[in-house]
């Protein structure tokens, strides 16, 4: 008799999930000498232990603590780049500006980036058919809780000047419901952080508006100010030129506004 299986609204676990996590871990530890001590099998066991045999709507931050411990890593606290709805450019930037780090430049962020996973209560199976959707099913699902946990820890670690890259092409440049808006903003520590500097990335080539005056940016400024942290904002009018100038800062065209 086929066993009844819960049908969730979201896509199922990414195919070859265990193999992908293990392969990513091995690759990361090879590229980053300071993480060569990490035992990737133990990392996978801890990752698996966070969600296997547990109800996928009843996952807690505590479930991920063994994984967090194994993924302990050094990131200079004054070199943190947060992002919202503009992941690709943020990652292109840190690939060039090697001394700055997004969450996905850390081991745990790298392991889980773009993946989906969930299990089933009381069975050791991974559910490849469907996983809970944050809105339609439940917020305490394995993927959402993972990102909430690592994002909170990343924000809590930040110090001095923290940068955030925001997508100026979206209707809500700052979105309170994004991971940045709902988790990271509220976990920056005023004892550690002096300033949050937003970089608003323009989409259109002829877009010369000051998007730092956008109502959602003003909302972000208000939230940050209420945390007793300074706020500043810069328009990045030409993201292509911005990246080029990060690569070649001595280029004569890089003295003008980008």
């Amino acid at each position: 008799v086929p066993r009844w299986r819960q049908q969730w609204s979201g896509p199922g676990t990414t195919k070859r999930f265990p193999e992908t996590v293990l392969a990513r871990c091995v690759k990361y530890t090879e590229i980053h000498p300071e993480m060569r001590h990490v035992d990737c099998q133990s990392v996978w066991d801890a990752f698996k232990g966070a969600f296997i045999s547990k109800h996928p709507c009843n996952i807690t931050e505590e479930d991920y603590q063994p994984l967090m411990k194994l993924g302990t890593q050094t990131v200079p606290c004054n070199k943190i780049l947060l992002w919202s709805r503009i992941k690709d450019l943020a990652h292109q930037f840190t690939q060039v500006q090697r001394d700055m780090f997004t969450l996905e430049d850390t081991l745990l962020g790298y392991l889980a980036d773009d993946l989906t996973w969930c299990g089933e209560f009381n069975t050791s199976k991974i559910n490849y058919q469907s996983c809970p959707d944050w809105r339609k099913d439940c917020s305490n699902n394995p993927v959402s809780v993972f990102w909430k946990t690592v994002s909170r820890r990343f924000a809590e670690a930040a110090c001095d000047v923290v940068h955030v890259m925001l997508n100026g092409s979206r209707s809500k440049i700052f979105d309170k419901n994004s991971t940045f808006g709902s988790v990271e903003v509220h976990n920056l520590q005023p004892e550690k952080v002096q300033t949050l500097e937003a970089w608003v990335i323009h989409g259109g080539r002829e877009d010369s508006r000051d998007l730092c005056q956008d109502p959602t940016i003003k909302e972000l400024e208000s939230i940050i100010s209420k945390r007793n942290i300074q706020f500043s904002c810069k328009n990045i009018y030409r993201p292509d030129k911005f990246l080029q100038c990060v690569k070649n800062p001595e280029d004569s065209s890089c003295t003008s506004e980008i």
């Epitope: 110090c159 005023p190 100010s225 945390r227 007793n228 300074q230």
Partner: antibody
Amino acid sequence: QIQLVQSGPELKKPGETVKISCKASGYTFTNYGMNWVKQAPGKGLKWMGWINTYTAEPTYADDFKGRFAFSLEASASTAYLQINNLKNEDMATYFCARKYGGYWGQGTTLTVSS
Amino acid sequence: DIVLTQSPPSLAVSLGQRATISCRASESVDSYGNSFIHWYQQKPGQSPKLLIYRASNLESGIPARFSGSGSRTDFTLTINPVEADDVATYYCQQVNEDPLTFGAGTKLELK
């Protein structure tokens, strides 16, 4: 340059109230929270809590809930510490210290004696 | 609450010698490998003065005779060589989480 200037020494009787001020200059007052720290005579430093200078919301350490109150006059860039119903064990030097950056006031000595 | 245990409580050092002060935390004060421990110097009748921030960074204007090291739970302040002006009490402070806490202090004297 950044300065935190506190009010002068206080001599009070048990049961009375004292209000200590801390005037900030050299930076935007509402950009940084203000910590309060107690140092009893010959003793170490103890964090009392802090006040958010933008929202005026205070946070008190467990040992300083009840008789202690942090407040602000933001327009004057000044933070206040008020202690009600003074007790002998309140006799100490009280420091204000800006959050982020290691800036401290010179301290205000409170003597409680009948 | 994170408890910071300083040792020794007092220390007598000859001029020109090295002084080493230890600070041990009851739990890690690291976040992503950044140690949120500061070191302060306090002279009688004065407010504390920041010497070292985040375990090993020398505050502007502080002589290079002062250095800090350590991670997670074990931290050290070193003064080498000790000068007469260094006679004071030294405190470690953790700012990784509320409540902020201080060590009990180490009193440095001259031999």
